[in-house]
Interface confidence: low
């Protein structure tokens, strides 16, 4: 039998689930912990101060809790503060936090005390300085001045002048005398040490306003926009840039140290980036506001004027049109035009439509067509109704049978079915 | 755009030679030095040689362990690099690339060609 | 023979920040500027650092490069999964008229 079926092995409440493996196993509620949910969970009732992340763990079937604790906290419970989070060990020390809950410093070489900010003066401790050096106490450390004829940090080596070398940049030392050298330079450099580099660009090739820039034994040319190459020689195709050179649609041609812009019609200016003002050619009439566009200009009337430049009296203003037609006015000559409502016609639209007369019968089913004023109406047959008289009425809507008889809809009438037994129009 | 193609590449026996060239594209080939570096398989990049634009003298220089084996040409009408290589040995077995010297100064190769590979193999 | 000395392999994490170093002598890195190339898998290098510590146009300025003395090192920040490359510093010998390239690093990306 299926391990769950035999009566729950979980306790308080835990949901029995088998495995893959056929055994039962816990999924034990909030507050208890344990193989079969039997201990009471010690995160439940929240140990650890602060925010502080609480851990439970089952240990031979004892049930426990550990705290992960925030920076600045420590202790089992996270309640102890850190000291070591002022960062109290100065010069690099490590801190560390005692047994009493203080911290405690691990001072670097150089440096004393419960923080390490002393200076230990390490020339008062002996004298490390040999051969008559002078000891220079220095901050964490010291030095020592030779005398002549001693080198390294304790003055313990004879001078050697050319070890180490004190040739920079490639130089080549040579001894010259006891304690003096020569030093070779490579090519670009000079001075005792060759520690000058030779300025390479008095007469340098760089064109086109590159600025020479020194290197070592060699020179770089430092381009203009326009101009590439090792001399600035090479012209840059500003036309392959992007984004285009050339705004708005113009068309880019390249030309030595430059380039130049073919504007397409409305733009100007050296990338095409300015919109020609057509309003300073533009002559709008009558005080109207000239608006600028694109290669184009655009009038706004003031009421009563009409047409490109405002120069004609709006027809429409005198209302020409009848009274539900639209009336727009002709940009070339000014005169109105009325767009007329559905039964209307004419210039002016003031002339009604006859539908009846027009075309076919609007009406259906023989109705008679009357005409109006712009519209009509359909004068319907018997049995029909509707606008148009396109729908049959159905006489049985009243019931008109009696007897639980059957009613049958027919054009302009009904007939009933009578059940055994009756008879007459309406099965009475 | 600056554009480097290498070719030439391919399987040749030890001792034999082999041309590879490098057609340049989009810039004053005469203008400037160009290189060839190899890398072998799995390996670093080693430089080979470089020859400078004849207008600056055309000094050619060589790596020490290609010199008197290696020719370094070019053919500034024909914007074409040239790398022929003689006395071929297995450690010459390599992905060849030409490179574009924008400065001596701190060796600034830029662009670089996407390689040809060679075989030295018996 | 590979006269500039650079870490066979460097690691990091996404977001993380890694040095590469390069170390030469006087006669190369000592009198010279350094380049920096990065070589994405199956692809040929790329121009990443010249002159020490400039970027080309199009180098994202989460790379950066330093010199002292003898020394040089790319620094990157930011790690992304895209970086996973080799890295090669290199520079000119003035004394032997030649290109000197490191041995290069390989760059892992975790």
């Known amino acids: 039998a299926p391990p769950c079926l035999d009566g729950s092995p979980c306790a308080n409440g835990g949901r029995c689930t088998q495995l893959p493996s056929r055994e039962a196993a816990c999924l034990c509620p909030p507050g208890w912990v344990g193989e079969r949910c039997q201990l009471e969970d010690p995160c439940h009732s929240g140990p650890c101060a602060g925010r502080g992340v609480c851990q439970s763990s089952v240990v031979a079937g004892t049930a426990r809790f550990s705290c992960r604790c925030p920076r600045g906290f420590r202790g089992p419970d996270c309640s102890l503060p850190d000291p070591c989070l002022s960062s109290p060990c100065a010069h690099g020390a490590r801190c560390s936090v005692g047994p009493d809950g203080r911290f405690l410093c691990s001072c670097p070489p150089g440096y004393q005390g419960r923080s390490c900010r002393s200076d230990v003066d390490e020339c008062r401790v002996g004298e490390p300085c040999r051969h008559g050096g002078t000891c220079l106490n220095t901050p964490g450390s010291f030095r020592c001045q030779c005398p002549a004829g001693y080198t390294g940090p304790l003055c313990e080596n004879p001078a050697v002048p050319c070890a180490p070398s004190p040739c920079r940049n490639g130089g080549t030392c040579r001894q010259s005398g006891d304690l003096t050298y020569d030093c070779a330079c490579l090519p670009g450099f000079e001075g005792q040490n060759c520690e000058v580099n030779v300025d390479d660009c008095p007469g340098h090739r760089c064109l086109n306003g590159g600025t020479c820039v020194d290197g070592v034994n060699t020179y770089n040319c430092q381009c203009p926009p326009e101009w590439t190459g090792q001399f600035c020689t090479e012209d840059v195709d500003e036309c392959q840039l992007q984004p285009n050179a050339c705004h708005n649609g113009g068309t880019c041609f390249n030309t030595l140290g430059g380039h130049s812009c073919v504007c397409v019609n409305g733009w100007t200016g050296e990338s095409c980036s300015q919109n020609i003002d057509d309003c300073a050619t533009a002559v709008c009439f009558h005080g109207a506001t000239c608006h600028d566009r694109v290669a184009s200009f655009y009038c706004a009337c003031p009421m009563g004027k009409t047409g490109l430049l405002c120069h004609l009296d709006d027809a429409c203003v005198s209302n020409p049109c009848h009274e539900d037609a639209i009336c727009d006015t002709n940009p070339v000559n000014g005169r109105a035009i009325c767009t007329c409502p559905p039964g209307f016609t004419g210039g002016a639209c003031d002339q009604d439509v006859d539908e009846c007369s027009i075309g076919a019968n609007p009406c259906e089913h023989l109705g008679r067509c009357v005409n109006t004023q712009g519209s009509f109406l359909c004068q319907c047959g018997r049995g029909y109704t509707g606008p148009r008289c396109e729908t049959d009425v159905n006489e049985c809507l009243s019931g008109p049978c009696r007897n639980q008889a059957t009613c049958l809809d027919r054009i302009g009438q009904f007939t009933c079915i009578c059940m055994a037994g009756f008879t007459g129009t309406y099965c009475e | 755009q600056v554009q480097l193609v290498e070719s030439g590449g391919g399987l040749v026996k030890p001792g034999g030679s082999l041309r590879l060239s490098c057609a340049a594209s989009g810039f004053t080939f005469s203008s400037y030095t160009m290189n060839w570096v190899r890398q072998a398989p799995g390996k670093g990049l080693e430089w080979v040689g470089r020859v400078k634009g004849e207008q600056f003298g055309g000094s050619i220089h060589y790596a020490a362990s290609v010199k008197g084996r290696f020719t370094i040409s070019r053919d500034d009408s024909k914007n074409t690099l040239y790398l022929q290589m003689n006395s071929l040995k297995t450690e010459d077995t390599a992905v060849y690339y030409c490179a574009r010297e924008r400065s001596r100064a701190g060796s600034i190769f830029d662009p670089w060609g996407q390689g040809t590979l060679v075989t030295v193999s018996s | 023979d590979i006269v500039l000395t650079q870490p066979p392999s460097v690691s990091g994490a996404p977001g993380q920040r890694v040095t590469i170093s390069c170390s030469g002598s006087s006669s190369n890195i000592g009198f010279n500027y350094v380049s920096w190339y990065q070589q994405l898998p199956g692809t040929a290098p790329k121009l990443l650092i010249y002159y020490n510590n400039q970027r080309p146009s199009g180098v994202p300025d989460r790379f950066s490069g330093s010199k002292s003395g003898t020394s040089a090192s790319l620094a990157i920040t930011g790690l992304q999964a895209e970086d996973e490359a080799d890295y090669y510093c290199?520079?000119?010998?003035?004394?032997?008229?030649?290109?000197?390239f490191g041995g290069g690093t390989k760059l892992t990306v975790l």
């Open positions: 290199s520079t000119w010998t003035g004394t032997s008229e030649s290109h000197v």
